[in-house]
Amino acid sequence: QKSSIEKCSVDIQQSRNKTTERPGLLNCPIYWQQLREKCLLFSHTVNPWNNSLADCSTKESSLLLIRDKDELIHTQNLIRDKAILFWIGLNFSLSEKNWKWINGSFLNSNDLEIRGDAKENSCISISQTSVYSEYCSTEIRWICQKELTPVRNKVYPDS
């Protein structure tokens, strides 16, 4: 994956009088790129799914969660090389016999058209054009995400 990167910085707003602040990410850090309300980090190197999951976690982020087909397409547009696969935060739950996002929700069958089998030790990868079921032990690249947060929430005293 090779795409231009916006140089952004993390800027946590200071609390001010009559304002409650929720510390969070207001801009994307360097090496991360913004896609709508998310910052995405496309790895350069390869790992199995579990290590990719752990890497995102240590970066105070998560493997990519895709809300709908529209977000999938916009993410795929950031992938320059057709041949490269990236892990996302979706794997097969054997106990529930369904695709499960790492946030605990299940895949809406209309969201992604997955190529490959839904079976034990299967994890989901995306390429520039498709979505694939792969053995979770396969070493490929991965995408981490951080959510951008609103700048501030104003709280006004009672009248």
């Epitope: 980090l41 790895s43 790992n47």
Partner: antibody, heavy 117, light 111 residues
Framework: EVQLVESGGGLVQPGGSLRLSCAAS????????MHWVRQVTGKGLEWVST???????KYSGSVKGRFTISRENAKNSLYLQMHSLRVGDTAVYYC???????????WGQGTLVTVSS | NFMLTQPHSVSESPGKTVTISCTRS????????VQWYQQRPGNSPTIVIY?????PSGVPDRFSGSIDSSSNSASLTISGLKTEDEADYYC??????????FGGGTKLTVL
Amino acid sequence: EVQLVESGGGLVQPGGSLRLSCAASGFTFSTYDMHWVRQVTGKGLEWVSTIGTAGDTKYSGSVKGRFTISRENAKNSLYLQMHSLRVGDTAVYYCTRAPVGAISDYWGQGTLVTVSS
Amino acid sequence: NFMLTQPHSVSESPGKTVTISCTRSSGSIASNYVQWYQQRPGNSPTIVIYEDNQRPSGVPDRFSGSIDSSSNSASLTISGLKTEDEADYYCQSYDSINHVVFGGGTKLTVL
């Protein structure tokens, strides 16, 4: 301010062992991959080893089986345990911070390892 | 594994433009990002270009990077050469199993 400070270099005989350390400060150490890179005086840079945030490790062919990279996040420290040292391992050893992939955006000042009888 | 080959040395006058090449021996230059590092005498390397053509903050815009698939090479171009640019320059990439690869280095002399 990001700082990487290597230590532990010195003179050792062929076949001997040495442990290098890299003290990191000014950033959240646990969220970064880390590399060791070495340089023979007057020569080019040579990658030695990488440790990922998940603890996964990689080694160059020339050191695999002899060197072990490790990290201690609680101490913001990176290590390189070197065994069966050879004359050809003589070099300045740098630790570097890797925000993503091979990128080394900060380098330490280096520590000199001399293997000689 | 592949190699990255750089010219041993290049030289140019102040104010001129110089380009340093980095040719990948096998596999596509476009398949993995290329970084460039500057190492002044007696100092540790510093990054001047990452991800083929991105410039870290603090690096002058006189420095630019590119890749050329037809020659399977990456290039570092320095315009408006200054005497302070005199240094060794190294390209760097990585292979399919996460091994980092450095070029042999190019000594830039500003005449």
